[in-house]
């Protein structure tokens, strides 16, 4: 019966205690994107820095080829910010001629790829119309939420237009996940 | 060997178990800002409410003089929202005369100051161009991510223009961090 | 004294260890909203999907009648994103006639209802002016922070205009909370 005081009655046997410092975690930061081919009708995925500066992966959470690989099943908080910047958006010029138009837009999607499912699953989407008149513009889209993920799942960040992503600073565009 | 069932094999000796309720945590809320001098080329730092209303600090996480002081090393989730509000931005008037212009902007930076490092480190930045025509405008910038912090690190929130920060409500502008 | 190595000296007796997988958690996703009456001077509350797709509730965190019910006292991270979409906002037409005007706006509030306080408490607010000229527009508002909640507290998400909420995809509009 020794040590029993460390196992209060509400603690389930099937969910063993584990040290917080032992949990899979990653924070990835932006790098300059190399143009790559991507599937038609699918937004291109960003690739990331995983070691330098503020970036890290730990406790079996690995980054490889645009994907964060989930090393154990559980509930994860997943987040990303992408900062976009561009010149005057097209729609504004059309608008000036008096013709309302579906605006240009910027979109970020955090996507899950699972072996057991043929289609990628969109976990989070941030999408915004951009109709700036006569100027350079820039703005972030932030996303974050909790998901039940399985060992072997892969996460990536897709964007509507890779050429609009601000890759200049690690604090502007980033991607992370941690086991709760 | 007694008590061994409470120490599953994946648990590392160097990362002791600890009660979640014992972890450093803080949620700070906005207060009216007193104009203070700040370093040239550095955005001014906000100061915060740490006790009243929704605000709290606990478990050795202390707030003092615009800084959250990190009391123990580990991985922290750090977040802030700043709501900005202003009158018509300058650039829109210039634009109306037909001259494209670099737009006004609003920026939030969560900054880390470390004794052992001369320069502050920008952990998170949210920056947005503002070109509103003929109106009062208001909008939030939200930031949040996970960072490996060291005991003694200090965190602050800097903004591009302190006079544009909406300090009227504790739910509009806030800053927090918690050990994972 | 056996098992003592699993109880480091900084661990408080009053805060028992507990398995992370045993903690209350929920991620709710958007559904089509049915028009309902709401209190005068109070923004309408959204209702949510709690079982299908990405949505789940677990460990005694229950969803019912627009509310997430907090099953045990503690510090929770609470978050929501609402994606809004609409046609040209009214203010832009007024502006075109040369009269500056308080802009249309979109607002999200995460609200706490507690039995010990007659007024709902606004935990988080994201509010943004919308003055889009001649176009359809869409954009998200994201919120997230940590709060000390009591057993029996109820959380809901209120919005300024339920008809502007994008209910088309579970990744665009969502609401969640988890015990830290």
């Amino acid at each position: 019966l020794k040590g029993q005081e460390f196992a209060p009655s509400h603690q389930q046997v099937y969910a063993p205690l584990r040290a917080d410092g032992d949990k899979p975690r990653a924070h990835l930061t932006v790098v300059r994107q190399t143009p790559t081919q991507h599937l038609k009708n699918q937004f291109p995925a960003l690739h990331w820095e995983h070691e330098l500066g503020l970036a890290f992966t730990k406790n079996r959470m690995n980054y490889t080829n645009k994907f964060l690989l989930i090393p154990e099943s559980g509930d994860y908080f997943v987040y990303s910010q992408v900062t976009f910047r561009g010149m005057t958006s097209e729609c504004s010029e059309i608008r000036q001629a008096g013709r309302p138009n579906k605006p240009d837009s910027i979109t970020v999607v955090i996507t899950k790829v699972t072996d057991s499912y043929p289609e990628p699953t969109q976990l989070l989407m941030g999408t915004k119309s951009v109709c700036e008149v006569g100027s350079n513009w820039f703005q972030p889209i932030y996303l974050g939420a909790m998901f039940s993920l399985q060992e072997g799942d892969k996460l990536m960040v897709n964007v509507s237009d890779i050429s609009l992503v601000d890759y200049t600073k690690e604090d502007k565009t980033f991607f992370g996940a941690f086991l709760l | 060997l007694k008590g061994q069932e409470f120490a599953p094999s994946h648990q590392q000796v160097y990362a002791p178990l600890r009660a979640d309720g014992d972890k450093p945590r803080a949620h700070l809320t906005v207060v009216r800002q007193t104009p203070t001098q700040h370093l040239k080329n550095q955005f001014p730092a906000l100061h915060w409410e740490h006790e009243l209303g929704l605000a709290f600090t606990k478990n050795r996480m202390n707030y003092t003089n615009k800084f959250l002081l990190i009391p123990e090393s580990g991985d922290y989730f750090v977040y802030s929202q700043v709501t900005f509000r202003g009158m018509t931005s300058e650039c829109s008037e210039i634009r109306q005369a037909g001259r494209p212009n670099k737009p006004d902007s609003i920026t939030v930076v969560i900054t880390k100051v470390t004794d052992s490092y001369p320069e502050p480190t920008q952990l998170l930045m949210g920056t947005k161009s503002v070109c509103e025509v003929g109106s009062n405008w208001f909008q939030p910038i939200y930031l949040g991510a996970m960072f490996s912090l060291q005991e003694g690190d200090k965190l602050m929130v800097n903004v591009s223009d302190i006079s544009l920060v909406d300090y009227t409500k504790e739910d509009k502008t806030f800053f927090g961090a918690f050990l994972l | 004294l056996k098992g003592q190595e699993f109880a480091p000296s900084h661990q408080q007796v009053y805060a028992p260890l507990r398995a992370d997988g045993d903690k209350p958690r929920a991620h709710l996703t958007v559904v089509r909203q049915t028009p309902t009456q709401h209190l005068k001077n109070q923004f309408p509350a959204l209702h949510w999907e709690h079982e299908l797709g990405l949505a789940f509730t677990k460990n005694r965190m229950n969803y019912t009648n627009k509310f997430l019910l907090i099953p045990e006292s503690g510090d929770y991270f609470v978050y929501s994103q609402v994606t809004f979409r609409g046609m040209t906002s009214e203010c832009s037409e007024i502006r075109q006639a040369g009269r500056p005007n308080k802009p249309d706006s979109i607002t999200v509030v995460i609200t706490k209802v507690t039995d010990s306080y007659p007024e709902p408490t606004q935990l988080l607010m994201g509010t943004k002016s919308v003055c889009e000229v001649g176009s359809n527009w869409f954009q998200p508002i994201y919120l997230g922070a940590m709060f000390s909640l009591q057993e029996g507290d109820k959380l809901m998400v209120n919005v300024s205009d339920i008809s502007l909420v994008d209910y088309t995809k579970e990744d665009k509009t969502f609401f969640g909370a988890f015990l830290l």
Epitope: - | - | T64, N65, L69, V113, D115, S116, P118, P120, G152, K154
Partner: antibody, heavy 116, light 106 residues
Framework: QVQLQESGPGLVRPSQTLSLTCTVS????????MHWVRQRPGRGLEWMGR????????KYNPSLKSRVTITRDTSKNQVSLRLSSVTAADTAVYYC?????????WGQGSLVTVSS | DIQMTQSPSSLSASVGDRVTITCRAS?????MYWYQQKPGKAPKLLIY???NLASGVPSRFSGSGSGTDFTFTISSLQPEDIATYYC?????????FGQGTKVEIK
């Protein structure tokens, strides 16, 4: 118009179970919390317990916990109180009240006498 | 249980007088409520959260205090204020009331 109306027998025999219903109009009980409070003759107010109607989650005064049950019927917008094994000491005016999320409001009260 | 000690148990004052009632909790509480109860009527909430005036309540009523010591004040007593006043804490289980203060006109 917002109203809380307590109803039930005015006389209950000792050792029997006291049952009262609070019928609500003008608001949805699921948007708030519902309480029962009693006031014995010439005495102060005693909180008996509360229910969170959306979930049915209850909280009771420990001094009454073994005897009190609060339930709700959301379809009828009603909350009920049951107090078992009553004695003369349970003679009181019983009030239902709401709290949380909207201004507090009380019913007008229902006098229940325990007597043989 | 958190005990609420209210004083005085009764008082008599003239119209226009300032009336003060105190309530002491046996341990610190965050939310204090003050109710008014007229004979044969249900209690009516006057003050919540220690110092917030409930909707429709005249501004002559006020509350203050924090932790364990709370005060309820009627700045200028009116004839319609004849009633019994109760404090109540919402922190612990059970929620407990003070024993009441009966206010009469001299």
């Amino acid at each position: 118009q917002v109203q809380l109306q307590e109803s039930g027998p005015g006389l209950v025999r000792p050792s029997q179970t006291l049952s009262l219903t609070c019928t609500v109009s003008g608001f949805d009980i699921q948007d708030t919390y519902m309480h029962w409070v009693r006031q014995r003759p010439g005495r102060g107010l005693e909180w008996m317990g509360r229910i969170e109607p959306a979930s049915g989650h209850t909280k009771y005064n420990p001094s009454l916990k073994s005897r009190v049950t609060i339930t709700r019927d959301t379809s009828k917008n009603q909350v009920s109180l049951r107090l078992s094994s009553v004695t003369a000491a349970d003679t009181a005016v019983y009030y239902c009240a709401r709290s949380g999320g909207m201004p507090d409001m009380w019913g007008q009260g229902s006098l229940v006498t325990v007597s043989s | 249980d958190i005990q609420m000690t209210q004083s005085p148990s009764s008082l008599s004052a003239s119209v226009g007088d300032r009336v003060t009632i105190t309530c002491r909790a046996s341990q610190g509480v965050m939310y204090m409520y003050w109710y008014q109860q007229k004979p044969g009527k249900a209690p009516k909430l006057l003050i919540y959260g220690a110092s917030n005036l409930a909707s429709g309540v005249p501004s002559r009523f006020s509350g203050s205090g924090s932790g364990t010591d709370f005060t309820f004040t009627i700045s200028s007593l009116q004839p319609e204020d004849i009633a019994t006043y109760y404090c109540q804490q919402w922190e612990g289980n059970p929620r407990t009331f003070g024993q009441g203060t009966k206010v009469e006109i001299k």
